[in-house]
Amino acid sequence: IIGGEFTTIENQPWFAAIYRRHRGGSVTYVCGGSLISPCWVISATHCFIDYPKKEDYIVYLGRSRLNSNTQGEMKFEVENLILHKDYSADTLAHHNDIALLKIRSKEGRCAQPSRTIQTICLPSMYNDPQFGTSCEITGFGKENSTDYLYPEQLKMTVVKLISHRECQQPHYYGSEVTTKMLCAADPQWKTDSCQGDSGGPLVCSLQGRMTLTGIVSWGRGCALKDKPGVYTRVSHFLPWIRSHTKEENGLAL
């Protein structure tokens, strides 16, 4: 996250930190995600497309720090990794950039709700906040485009939803932006998501409930003028989410 502020997981208790195990045994941070039911985390397909082996991934819930433990955190294996079959990224844009991870602890359990672990509500079909609404993004992504390392502490910031008409202007992203995407940015272009924030939540208040409105997907640079963050529009993927999680009880739809 460029700009914004450091936070703790209590403020974003649905945030999932996804890591990849390498052959040599090292573990690196991959992407963020959001807990949408006790057994399911939602993220972005582009995070996994190059290494789609579920056994390679570890998911932490209740974690405030990148490389050290947080009291009450839970560690999970990925029982099922579902990537969108129509994902594509021929150009700058990522299409259908959504993924589901079914999580299971070593003991065979899903997430146990606590002060630091909670699910986030999904929107209803095609129901999004008005453009201009302030929403939160969270992640362990870079604090500057040029940084080599990710920050150790979880960060969050506030961005405003931008209309499709504005985002499709030629000096923004033109027709790269589709109706299955949402754009959001800081009016001063000072704060934004960046590399490492992918897959994480764009959360907005909708009818008084904190709702997962978007998934961090793509953008040109980070916090560049006229180059907003682009997010997978969750309200347009509810049938896909339902069809892949339907055997699971307790999904907050």
Epitope: D90, S175, Q195, S198, G221, C222
Partner: antibody
Framework: EVQLVQSGGGLVKPGRSLRLSCTAS????????MSWVRQAPGKGLEWVGF?????????TEYAAVKGRFTISRDDSKSIAYLQMNSLKTEDTAVYYC???????WGQGTLVTVSS | EIVLTQSPLSLPVTPGEPASISCRSS???????????LDWYLQKPGQSPQLLIY???NRAPGVPDRFSGSGSGTDFTLKISRVEAEDVGVYYC?????????FGQGTKLEIK
């Protein structure tokens, strides 16, 4: 094996029209965007335009030729087209079609605009 | 529109020696996922261009490992570790982060 076979080039007078075709084989044509690039004699490469796959709206993007050139596709025949209207002498070039934004290139077809 | 500037424009090389071509962009070519939307092509005499490197540093299938791409943001380099006679031609960089896509002017590699 991916193949892009181009046709439709030739000599044409200024102000007239020409349609280039790019017939694809060896891959699922409908899944891919298609691009056109041109190269004036003895010069460098110039990007002409691009058409997305139908799954992503089949929308087009153009360079400076916008308004005179139109890119279209017929997925049932695996053909991409470049319709060139109001041709000018400076449009004289070898035109290449490309699978996606960058991958496989056709053999090129020469368009000469001269009176 | 994004301007790509290649240097040198002409590059005479002895076979077996390394070669390096630079491509500078007027704007960043990096997206926020860390990918650099810059490709390198070789156009051999009388042939269509062929893709060598995509997304800044990924070799296209079938491209010999003596070719490598590096760089990030606005500065990119194509390196040939040991030039062979078959490497002669014109090398182009191309950005595809923003429409209209644009090419560098080309670098002509010739054998000394």
């Amino acid at each position: 094996e991916v193949q892009l076979v181009q046709s439709g080039g030739g000599l044409v007078k200024p102000g007239r029209s020409l349609r280039l075709s790019c017939t694809a084989s060896g891959f699922t044509f409908g899944d891919y965007a298609m691009s056109w690039v041109r190269q004036a004699p003895g010069k460098g490469l110039e990007w002409v335009g691009f058409i997305r796959s139908k799954a992503y709206g089949g929308t087009t993007e153009y360079a400076a030729v916008k308004g005179r050139f139109t890119i279209s596709r017929d997925d049932s025949k695996s053909i991409a087209y470049l319709q060139m209207n109001s041709l000018k002498t400076e449009d004289t070039a070898v035109y290449y079609c490309i699978r996606g934004a960058n991958w496989n290139w056709g053999q090129g077809t020469l368009v000469t605009v001269s009176s | 529109e994004i301007v790509l500037t290649q240097s040198p424009l002409s590059l005479p090389v002895t076979p077996g020696e390394p070669a390096s071509i630079s491509c500078r962009s007027s704007q960043t070519l990096m997206n926020r996922n860390g990918n650099n939307f810059l490709d390198w092509y070789l156009q051999k005499p009388g042939q269509s261009p062929q893709l060598l490197i995509y997304l800044g540093s990924n070799r296209a299938p079938g491209v010999p490992d003596r070719f490598s791409g590096s760089g990030s943001g606005t500065d990119f380099t194509l390196k040939i570790s040991r030039v062979e006679a078959e490497d002669v031609g014109v090398y182009y960089c191309m950005q595809r982060i923003e429409f209209p896509y644009t090419f560098g002017q080309g670098t002509k590699l010739e054998i000394k």
